[in-house]
């Protein structure tokens, strides 16, 4: 009689993660008597995947009933495949012996490759806010995909970015891979409503790429512009001075009025007006009793925005003239050294 052959018809198979893999194996003879075992890998470090008679293999089922007298089909099905299951599987026939069974013949092996989807890309921006005209870095990470080939693109408001660097790890063979990309983005004053998008395309996604986004509102700080103006007031001895705080983001803002360098009032911004570009405006006013001052008054509007060093704008109020005559003199006074230019 012809010597037993172990036939593994599939040289390779590819399975999506989470699905089942069927590994085919048949033998051509019932002799010699002895069990079939399945291994992943070859040599002394090989991993036992299935033993016909003993061992705990909850993910493995046999395709046919191995207890049937003339059974020659030793195919197995492995459930819930993960990238860690990738490798070459060997169907091995053993001959009963003493003290241990003796390996008799092995199949040629079936290489199992696992297609695994990348995780949803996670985009993260800088730890601290940055102002317009500055360049900031965004990172995008996605993990657990296989095979290694993957495409990553960056977009800002739908426009593809070109200034980025991408790495796929590890460089050599692995059960699964990770991608890491860093993109550089130049901020503009209009970016409060902008989004940065990382798009990942992979064979497992069937043309429907995964996207991760970051809102530039989390990254940008738009410093305010200040304008101090004097308004005429009907009351004989009172002048209304306003401080217009314009085009700032985020909302966190504290304003202090100083009269000749002395703190007059401090207030936190509330009831803000939102601009179309996502920035905010706010106005504060100060009612100055002119009769309480003999000399000219230097009024300063000092603004601390989002924890940054204060910026200020001053206005010189002449007390010698009649308040109503001053109404036309609305030009702001000279800016202090720390003031933001208008």
């Amino acid at each position: 009689e012809e010597e037993l052959q172990v036939i593994q018809p599939d040289k390779s198979i590819s399975v999506a993660a989470g699905e089942s893999a069927t590994l085919h194996c048949t033998v051509t003879s019932l002799i010699p008597v002895g069990p079939i075992q399945w291994f992943r890998g070859a040599g002394p470090g090989r991993e036992l995947i299935y033993n016909q008679k003993e061992g705990h293999f909850p993910r493995v089922t046999t395709v046919s009933d191995l207890t049937k007298r003339n059974n020659m089909d030793f195919s197995i099905r492995i459930s819930n495949i993960t990238p860690a299951d990738a490798g070459t599987y060997y169907c091995v026939k053993f001959r009963k012996g003493s003290p241990d069974h003796v390996e008799f013949k092995s199949g040629a092996g079936t290489e199992l490759s696992v297609r695994a989807k990348p995780s949803a890309p996670v985009v993260s921006g800088p730890a601290a806010r940055a102002t317009p005209q500055h360049t900031v870095s965004f990172t995008c990470e996605s993990h657990g995909f296989s095979p290694r080939d993957i495409t990553l693109k960056w977009f800002k408001n739908g426009n593809e970015l070109s200034d980025f660097q991408t790495n796929v790890d590890p460089a050599g063979d692995s059960v699964s891979y990770s991608i890491h990309s860093t993109a550089k983005v130049v901020l503009t004053r209009e970016d409060v409503h902008s989004q940065v998008i990382c798009e990942v395309a992979h064979v497992t996604l069937q043309g429907d790429p995964l996207r991760g986004t970051a809102n530039l509102s989390e990254t940008i700080r738009v410093p305010p512009t200040l304008e101090v103006t004097q308004q005429p007031v009907r009351a004989e001895n009172q002048v209304n001075v306003t401080c217009q705080v314009r085009k700032f983001y985020p909302q966190r803002l504290q304003l202090t009025w100083l009269e000749n360098g002395n703190v007059s009032r401090t207030e936190t911004a509330s009831t803000l007006t939102e601009n179309k570009d996502g920035t905010y405006n706010w106005m504060s006013w100060l009612l100055v009793n002119v009769s309480a001052h003999r000399d000219d008054v230097k009024l300063t509007c000092q603004v601390e925005h989002d924890g940054q060093p204060a910026v200020s704008k001053s206005h010189d109020l002449k007390v010698s003239a009649h308040p109503k005559e001053q109404g036309s003199n609305t030009a702001p006074g000279p800016a202090l050294a720390s003031a933001a230019p208008l």
Partner: antibody
Framework: EVQLQQSGVEVVQPGASVKLSCTAS????????MHWVKQRTEQGLEWIGR????????KYAPKFQGKATMTADTSSSTAYLQLSSLTSDDTAVYYC???????WGQGTTLTVSS | QIVLTQSPAIMSASPGEKVTLTCSAS???????LYWYQQKPGSSPKLWIY???NLASGVPPRFSGSGSGTSYSLTISSMQAEDAASYFC?????????FGGGTKLEIK
């Protein structure tokens, strides 16, 4: 549901023999080896041996060679462990275990006493 | 034959404490063939960990197993009262198959 039902308590005199049984249900006994394990009171576990019910082929730990004999009857889905020339050292709980290792019988308590 | 030595033989741990039980083999055991059992008084042993690191059905995730060659371990990340039991390692890499002497784990 997989079950291994073992025979009840045995009290036997020294020098005698005893045959313990383990009846399988919920699976085909020929599909797995059947193992036997000994546990003395408050002691560890000792592997006695295993049998392939399909053809009766068996392996024994050296310590139990000549002491234990394993057999199986596939028609009744029952595995047997015969222990001979009993001494007080054989007093123990004996378990049968399916080859997949997750199913154990409830154990048979054997007491050897005069 | 392969002798499996477990240490410590007896130990006690407080709730929440990390516990590591070791199993040392007199010669190399393939990781596929190293199993752990849990046994409580009056009950049959229960398969607890198979193929060195895989938890059997129903085993809490605070348990883990690791090792290779001649050195294996079972770890409980945070000891619970219900973990008090005896634990046995077992090899079926080569005949005769053997059990370790066991570790009796008590709760403080």
């Amino acid at each position: 549901e997989v079950q291994l039902q073992q025979s009840g308590v045995e009290v036997v005199q020294p020098g005698a023999s005893v045959k313990l049984s383990c009846t399988a249900s919920g699976f085909n006994i020929e599909a797995y080896y059947m193992h036997w394990v000994k546990q003395r009171t408050e002691q560890g576990l000792e592997w006695i041996g295993r049998i392939d019910p399909e053809d009766g082929e068996s392996k024994y730990a050296p310590k139990f060679q000549g002491k234990a004999t394993m057999t199986a009857d596939t028609s009744s889905s029952t595995a047997y462990l015969q222990l001979s020339s009993l001494t007080s050292d054989d007093t123990a709980v004996y378990y049968c275990v399916r080859g997949s290792y997750e199913y154990w019988g409830q154990g048979t308590t054997l007491t050897v006493s005069s | 034959q392969i002798v499996l030595t477990q240490s410590p033989a007896i130990m006690s741990a407080s709730p929440g404490e990390k516990v590591t039980l070791t199993c040392s083999a007199s010669s190399s055991v393939s990781s596929s063939y190293l199993y752990w059992y849990q046994q409580k008084p009056g009950s049959s042993p229960k398969l607890w960990i198979y193929s060195t690191s895989n938890l059997a059905s129903g085993v809490p995730p605070r348990f883990s197993g690791s090792g290779s060659g001649t050195s294996y371990s079972l770890t409980i990340s945070s000891m619970q009262a219900e973990d008090a039991a005896s634990y046995f390692c077992y090899q079926w890499s080569s005949y005769p198959y053997t059990f370790g002497g066991g570790t009796k784990l008590e709760i403080k």
